[in-house]
Amino acid sequence: TLNSVLNSNAIKNLPPPLGGAAGHPGSAVSAAPGILYPGGNKYQTIDNYQPYPCAEDEECGTDEYCASPTRGGDAGVQICLACRKRRKRCMRHAMCCPGNYCKNGICVSSDQNHFRGEIEETITESFGNDHSTLDGYSRRTTLSSKMYHTKGQEGSVCLRSSDCASGLCCARHFWSKICKPVLKEGQVCTKHRRKGSHGLEIFQRCYCGEGLSCRIQKDHHQASNSSRLHTCQRHHHHHHHHHH
């Protein structure tokens, strides 16, 4: 649900702060980065949309990327821009809208939303359909014909959650984003009430699974409100969650 996407990501093992902008209510991943928010402009009207400053693509919504608003503009002044549709020019995968990736400077359709298709295509061009190996170690010859037709498994690099198999989401790990398991009932999550207060986060948990939301654990009382343990819990039928 929207609420669980908003609230259920937890980060740990932080390195020393490295800077970064504050969270953006419309972003897929916060500027920290680490907290998933509802995706991009689709929850905002054009009238109230305001350019959001960013440093990296993942600080923007799923339908946005981070760049200077003017061609050849100051790289220090970047904002979240609308993603580019098929056949539009691009420089990296995140510039292309979901379901596409950047190949040879143009946004092209991904196979099964697999945004790394460029690598597999390179292999097909180089080796054709011959999947034999010379010494058992010509590892690039079979750069995963199976991966090309399936979504990312646990630990696979991803750009968006749609790149991952069912039950997984795309979340930050170190300096990349990988497919990780969606949280199950009882698993720890972190509910960030104040956006932009979480510092730089490089280990990110998925959101809570279907029918679950990130809520404070009952009978877990601590002096500090901010340090209370949150877990993925079943929705109460009589209880509804709303955004603030």
Partner: antibody, heavy 117, light 111 residues
Framework: EVQLVESGGGLVQPGGSLRLSCAAS????????ISWVRQAPGKGLEWVAS???????YYPDSVKGRFTISRDNAKNSLYLQMNSLRAEDTAVYYC???????????WGQGTTVTVSS | EIVLTQSPATLSLSPGERATLSCRAS??????????MNWYQQKPGQAPRLLIY???KQGSGIPARFSGSGSGTDFTLTISSLEPEDFAVYYC?????????FGGGTKVEIK
């Protein structure tokens, strides 16, 4: 074909500086994080620095303040500026990236840095 | 930081034999439902090559004779039947925490 080619290694005196380069090809360079990993003669592997696709940088304490990792996405190039070099920085320096999974799944062949007087 | 200890330091075996390499972490490398343990092979004068990631998943194009297992702090790399090209040094690496760290290596040599 994915390729990473390092250059810039050489002999330098303690306290000196050196700039390593890594030329990447065969993938959309600007979309991926990339790292430097080193290996001292006869020793194991040690992570040196990483930079995300968006340019955020990460270092271990052993090189923080002395080494600077950077990237030029327009040139498909990665750099490592090494200052205040010490004898213990002597190693083969590899650039490595993570294209398919979170591990270092593609490596260059390395460039040798020797710090000696 | 997480310290990885590999054993044995050297393993002397003949082609066709089974090799079992061990890696022990100073603390659990499991998180987010994944064991963040990787294995690499390195031959003299060459760069490391990824064999196994997430404890048991094979890297691209890696022969089926290489398999990984384990969780928490104890991990194993198994080569079911050694080929002549398998004699090399093998490193484990954890990616649960910054800094990512490597084990000291196990050399698999011809008996």
């Amino acid at each position: 074909e994915v390729q990473l080619v390092e250059s810039g290694g050489g002999l330098v005196q303690p306290g000196g500086s050196l700039r390593l380069s890594c030329a990447a090809s065969g993938f959309t360079f600007s979309s991926y994080a990339i790292s430097w990993v080193r290996q001292a003669p006869g020793k194991g592997l040690e992570w040196v620095a990483s930079v995300s696709g968006g340019g955020r940088t990460y270092y271990p304490d052993s090189v923080k303040g002395r080494f600077t990792i950077s990237r030029d996405n327009a040139k498909n190039s990665l750099y490592l500026q090494m200052n205040s070099l010490r004898a213990e920085d002597t190693a083969v320096y590899y650039c490595a990236t993570s294209l398919e999974n979170y591990a270092f799944d593609y490596w260059g062949q390395g460039t040798t840095v020797t710090v000696s007087s | 930081e997480i310290v990885l200890t590999q054993s044995p330091a050297t393993l002397s075996l003949s082609p066709g034999e089974r090799a079992t390499l061990s890696c022990r972490a100073s603390e659990s490398v499991d998180d987010f439902g994944i064991s963040f343990m990787n294995w690499y092979q390195q031959k003299p004068g060459q760069a490391p090559r990824l064999l196994i990631y997430a404890a048991s998943k094979q890297g691209s194009g890696i022969p089926a004779r290489f398999s990984g297992s384990g969780s928490g702090t104890d991990f194993t790399l198994t080569i079911s039947s050694l080929e002549p090209e398998d004699f090399a040094v093998y490193y484990c690496q954890q990616a649960k925490e910054v800094p990512p760290t490597f084990g000291g290596g196990t050399k698999v040599e011809i008996k």
